[in-house]
């Protein structure tokens, strides 16, 4: 009696199942009690000797490529051996690599967690994922795993993390990079500083007083509000960041406390108050202001 090993499918793709069947074309296995055993190269597979002429392999990998055969043993201990069959496991190269961010859109608050998720639409086996920062890439991390996605985490984002990022996936057919993704770090405004600027050391009535408000940190655009004794004087915008100024033509009523507020949509901060007082210098005919 002759024995044949049949693999289905005969050219499996990595990660897919394969069924090995030990066939005896000229002998029904029911005619006699047979025990079956399957081998790869020199090693027995699965449970060893079994009454089933089939062996199910749940997932085949590149390293499972090899020479397979089976043996059948009768109750009388006669052993039949099949010819060897070469099974080549096909690896699918990585394709369509993409990089996504969590939170989506690549906008993240300073101090928050950022995750860079690298994915491949296709690819089998062990895939090495690498993450790079900057157009001329600085390698941040690499991970090798048997999955189509991998994550790189920045637990607490800093201002210096605002950059371009990309990832690369590779499974033996050459590296494949994703497109670039830009990370914008959103920074709440710091407490602004209010400065009063006058054309001379002691400003007089009808002089123009400049109120300059500036938050030293904070993502643009920044909106500044100017106050006199908690009454709104007006607002100014700084579309590219930096400070903003508000001009006042002075009268006697402008004595008192001034403050400003900075707001960039991520929180508002109020400056310390600056006091402006009128003084009447000896021999002077007009009132003067000092701060």
């Amino acid at each position: 009696a002759e024995l044949f090993l049949i693999a289905s499918p005969s050219h499996p793709t990595e990660g897919s199942p394969v069924t090995l069947t030990c066939k005896m074309p000229f002998l029904q296995s029911s005619d006699a009690q047979f025990q079956f055993c399957f081998f790869r190269d020199t090693r027995a597979l699965g449970p060893g000797w079994s009454s089933s002429p089939k062996l199910q392999i749940a997932a085949m990998w590149k390293e499972d490529t090899g020479s397979y055969w089976c043996e059948a043993q009768t109750m009388a201990s006669k052993v039949l051996r099949s010819r060897r069959s070469q099974i080549n496991v096909h690896r699918v190269p990585v394709a369509d690599v993409s990089l996504e961010t969590q939170p989506p859109g690549g906008q993240v608050m300073e101090g928050d967690r950022l995750v860079l998720i690298c994915s491949v639409a296709m690819g089998t086996g062990d895939i090495t994922f690498l993450w790079y920062k900057g157009a001329v890439g600085l390698n941040l991390q690499s991970k090798t795993q048997r999955s189509l996605t991998a994550e790189y985490e920045i637990p607490s984002v800093r201002e210096s993390d605002a950059e371009q990022y990309y990832c690369v996936a590779e499974n033996g057919y050459g590296p494949s990079p994703s497109g670039l993704v830009s990370i914008t770090v959103r920074i709440p405004v710091s407490r602004p500083i209010l400065m009063l600027r006058a054309p001379r050391a002691q400003a007089a009535v009808e002089d123009v007083l400049e109120l300059h408000c500036e938050a030293l940190r904070g993502s643009p655009p920044i909106l500044y509000w100017f106050y006199h004794e908690d009454i709104t004087l007006g607002s100014r915008s700084a579309p590219s960041g930096g400070g903003a100024s508000f001009n006042l033509s002075l009268t006697e009523e402008h004595s008192g406390n001034y403050s400003c507020e900075a707001n960039n949509g991520l929180g508002a901060q109020r400056s310390e108050a600056v006091t402006l007082n009128f003084t009447v210098p000896t021999g002077a005919r007009s009132n003067h202001l000092t701060s």
Epitope: A135, V136, G137, L138, N139, P177, S178, G179, L180
Partner: antibody
Framework: QVQLVQSGAEVKKPGASVKVSCKAS????????IHWVRQAPGQGLEWMGW????????KYNEKFKGRVTITADTSTSTAYMELSSLRSEDTAVYYC????????????WGQGTLVTVSS | DIVMTQSPLSLPVTPGEPASISCRSS???????????LEWYLQKPGQSPQLLIY???NRFSGVPDRFSGSGSGTDFTLKISRVEAEDVGVYYC?????????FGQGTKVEIK
């Protein structure tokens, strides 16, 4: 297939500005940096700067800072290079080029735009 | 700025013969990430530049294997093992390691 198609030749007077466009097709515009390189007549190549269209963030060669503005319009997949305060030595062919990260090279170039500065 | 100096500036060649172009940088162009971003481009008459070699010695896809790149640190070489008529044009080395990125002044290759 990937293509970078630039706007036509320009003649400008000294002191004027010029804006050259570079329309990209055949790939995801926001995935790669676009660079600008110029070449004066009979001269070599000079790198001017780049933009990442994904966030519109440009980087410039200090030599041109204050005179060059590189922008990108993702709705039309077009990059622009504007050069102001033109002088006769700005007469050159201006190229846009796509740069592939990781491998790091300019793989596709526009056909070039001749800008002539003459009074 | 890093100055890229090519030599010779003009190279008359005989088809079938080898050719070599040298490119020297004024300082090391090894990037802080360990890579050396040295590329070679060929500009044929009336055309845009086209890539030949990247990262010192990697041949771009579709570039004939008669082109090879070598070197390290500050000294780099482009070799053509057997020049063909279609190889005429101006060859530029380029460094993309340190901003501002810079090109060599070019080497004009022409048939004798």
């Amino acid at each position: 297939q990937v293509q970078l198609v630039q706007s036509g030749a320009e003649v400008k007077k000294p002191g004027a500005s010029v804006k050259v466009s570079c329309k990209a097709s055949g790939y995801t515009f926001t995935s790669y940096n676009i660079h600008w390189v110029r070449q004066a007549p009979g001269q070599g190549l000079e790198w001017m700067g780049w933009i990442y269209p994904g966030d519109g963030n440009p980087k410039y060669n200090e030599k041109f800072k204050g005179r060059v503005t590189i922008t990108a319009d993702t709705s039309t997949s077009t990059a622009y290079m504007e050069l102001s305060s033109l002088r006769s030595e700005d007469t050159a062919v201006y190229y846009c080029a796509r740069r592939i990260h990781y491998y790091d090279y300019f793989d596709y170039w526009g056909q070039g735009t001749l800008v002539t500065v003459s009074s | 700025d890093i100055v890229m100096t090519q030599s010779p500036l003009s190279l008359p060649v005989t088809p079938g013969e080898p050719a070599s172009i040298s490119c020297r940088s004024s300082q090391s162009i090894v990037h802080s990430n360990g890579n050396t971003y040295l590329e070679w481009y060929l500009q044929k008459p009336g055309q845009s530049p086209q890539l030949l070699i990247y990262k010192v010695s990697n041949r771009f896809s579709g570039v004939p294997d008669r082109f090879s790149g070598s070197g390290s640190g500050t000294d780099f070489t482009l070799k053509i093992s057997r020049v063909e008529a279609e190889d005429v044009g101006v060859y530029y080395c380029f460094q993309g390691s340190h901003v501002p990125w810079t090109f060599g002044q070019g080497t004009k290759v022409e048939i004798k």
